[in-house]
Interface confidence: medium
């Protein structure tokens, strides 16, 4: 019985259940293609359990294989908007440390106004993920249209 | 040894591994934009382990953070069909209890005939998820083209 | 203390954390619509922990419910490319053993150059998953544009 109680008292974080779901805060200044994210229960349904935000970018706290997912919807968009402003591309990658910089996931909008995808990838403690949106189109900040998250899957 | 046996006999559900994958049963009557789902091994590869169906809508049985995913393909569809009938939009949300009603995930078809996405979101026991398809286009019932599922990720 | 140590020494595989993320190796000869995959740390960020590759196709080693995900991007593609060569379709299915052959996930490109989706499905030890790309268009081999993976979720 005492063992069972001790089990229950182990913090979830020690089980490696790191997880985060973020909503868009704002886009960067003119020459900065990065999207800036925010998360926390006060903001709605976004949260960070383990990973942290560093100036709007997601920083990983635990080594492991993660499922990374993203959806970005362009604001005030029709298929003609998207095709006229082609190429509008979204890339998710490790942007720091510089030695580990790599693009993990890339999608173009072509004639659509939303991209959504997901992938498994190894990430290490300290890796910062950036989401770069090229082009001049504006992403929607609606929390059901634009979001970005990670889920720790295994060591 | 007895402890190990006791461990093995714990039902999986007690570990919080709630999961469901549903296939489309039918669309609602004229004024009802909801899709009605079905699941179970007798139907093919759909299943419910934990969550339940309530009149074709998915009801959550365990509090936690869930990965929600969906794919909907329009029947007898070409890119011109989709653009002519624009806006055709799919929204996944909590529809009951009314106090927790919120849109979780929203996508428009624009010039495509399939939408697919996924997100992490907190859900509570008793939350019912509805999937609303606006417009007059018909979703495909093929089980490899249209499906909807949830996976419990952590408390 | 001894019990805790024994727990730590259990191989991860025994916990059922089978997972794989693959990158495109090559397409098949003229009459073979299958995509051929490769994985391993020497190749970049792809890996196999549990499942194996059998002549470029993914073979499952553990019974359970899996999250299957895929993204395929067409090479040198614009929305006119995709619509001119319609239908270009990607299907993920169990291709062997023949008795269990079934399509699990199907998407058409229509006017887009990328498809991405995911679903939960039961898979059994020995199931081989094939990814069939119909049509004559060429998939990109960039590792951030085309990938295929599975994640064991529960028994």
């Amino acid at each position: 019985q005492r063992f069972a109680q001790a089990q229950q008292q182990l913090p979830l974080e020690s089980l490696g259940w790191d997880v985060a779901e973020l909503q868009l805060n704002h886009t960067g200044p003119q020459q900065d293609p990065r999207l800036y994210w925010q998360g926390g229960p006060a903001l709605g349904r976004s949260f960070l359990h383990g990973p942290e935000l560093d100036k709007g970018q997601l920083r990983i706290h635990r080594d492991g294989i993660y499922m990374v997912h993203i959806q970005v919807t362009l604001a005030i968009c029709s298929s003609t908007t998207a095709s006229r402003h082609h190429p509008t591309t979204l890339a998710v990658g490790i942007c720091s440390p510089a030695s580990r910089s790599i693009s993990l996931l890339r999608l173009s909008f072509h004639q659509g106004c939303t991209i959504a995808s997901q992938r498994l990838t190894p990430l290490a403690r300290g890796d910062t993920l950036c989401t770069n949106l090229t082009g001049t189109l504006l992403p929607s900040r609606n929390t059901d249209e634009t979001f970005f998250g990670v889920q720790w899957v295994r060591p | 040894q007895r402890f190990a046996q006791a461990q093995q006999q714990l039902p999986l559900e007690s570990l919080g591994w709630d999961v469901a994958e549903l296939q489309l049963n039918h669309t609602g009557p004229q004024q009802d934009p909801r899709l009605y789902w079905q699941g179970g091994p007798a139907l093919g590869r759909s299943f419910l382990h934990g969550p339940e169906l309530d009149k074709g809508q998915l009801r959550i049985h365990r509090d936690g953070i869930y990965m929600v995913h969906i794919q909907v393909t329009l029947a007898i569809c070409s890119s011109t069909t989709a653009s002519r009938h624009h806006p055709t939009t799919l929204a996944v949300g909590i529809c009951s209890p009314a106090s927790r009603s919120i849109s979780l995930l929203r996508l428009s078809f624009h010039q495509g005939c399939t939408i697919a996405s996924q997100r992490l979101t907190p859900l509570a026991r008793g939350d019912t998820l509805c999937t609303n398809l606006t417009g007059t286009l018909l979703p495909s019932r093929n089980t490899d083209e249209t499906f909807f599922g949830v996976q419990w990720v952590r408390p | 203390q001894r019990f805790a140590q024994a727990q730590q020494q259990l191989p991860l595989e025994s916990l059922g954390w089978d997972v794989a993320e693959l990158q495109l190796n090559h397409t098949g000869p003229q009459q073979d619509p299958r995509l051929y995959w490769q994985g391993g740390p020497a190749l970049g960020r792809s890996f196999l922990h549990g499942p194996e590759l059998d002549k470029g196709q993914l073979r499952i080693h553990r019974d359970g419910i899996y999250m299957v995900h895929i993204q395929v991007t067409l090479a040198i593609c614009s929305s006119t490319t995709a619509s001119r060569h319609h239908p270009t379709t990607l299907a993920v299915g169990i291709c062997s053993p023949a008795s269990r052959s079934i399509s699990l996930l199907r998407l058409s490109f229509h006017q887009g150059c990328t498809i991405a989706s995911q679903r939960l499905t039961p898979l059994a030890r020995g199931d081989t998953l094939c990814t069939n790309l119909t049509g004559t268009l060429l998939p990109s081999r960039n590792t951030d544009e085309t990938f295929f993976g599975v994640q064991w979720v529960r028994p």
Epitope: R106 | - | N25, T27, G28, A75, I76, L137, S140, R141, N142
Partner: nanobody, 125 residues
Framework: QLQLVESGGGLVQPGGSLRLSCAVS????????MAWFRQAPGKEREIVAV????????AYADSVKGRFTIAKDSAKNTVYLQMNSLKPEDTAVYYC??????????????????WGQGTQVTVSS
């Protein structure tokens, strides 16, 4: 690395045709695809067409679709670019390249591990 040698370029009138050849020698087992690029004076190098080494799947830049055809003869280890209905704007140096990746973008040049020296195509009356 592969060795690639292009031939078949020349001067042709608008509306005319040419067939470029690219002879491939070396180990092709790790090659995903063969591509034709072109570079016009003062412009960036751009991709024209690609064919997979194993399966004969193809992709074309919008600017040449319906006019150019890429093909290969595995027995001769040669890749061809048949160019019909040539236009003055097709004037460029055409390069053959062996590719390990192939980008979704027609601007993508990374991943191409071997290049030929190029052959000049001039379309003029």
């Amino acid at each position: 690395q592969l060795q690639l040698v292009e031939s078949g370029g020349g001067l042709v009138q608008p509306g005319g045709s040419l067939r470029l050849s690219c002879a491939v020698s070396g180990r092709t087992s790790s090659t995903y695809a063969m591509a034709w690029f072109r570079q016009a004076p003062g412009k960036e190098r751009e991709i024209v067409a690609v064919i997979t080494w194993s399966g004969g799947r193809t992709a074309y830049a919008d600017s040449v679709k319906g006019r150019f055809t890429i093909a290969k003869d595995s027995a001769k280890n040669t890749v061809y670019l048949q160019m019909n209905s040539l236009k003055p704007e097709d004037t460029a140096v055409y390069y053959c390249a062996a590719d390990s990746e192939v980008s979704s973008s027609s601007e993508g040049q990374y991943g191409y591990e071997s290049w030929g020296q190029g052959t000049q195509v001039t379309v003029s009356s």
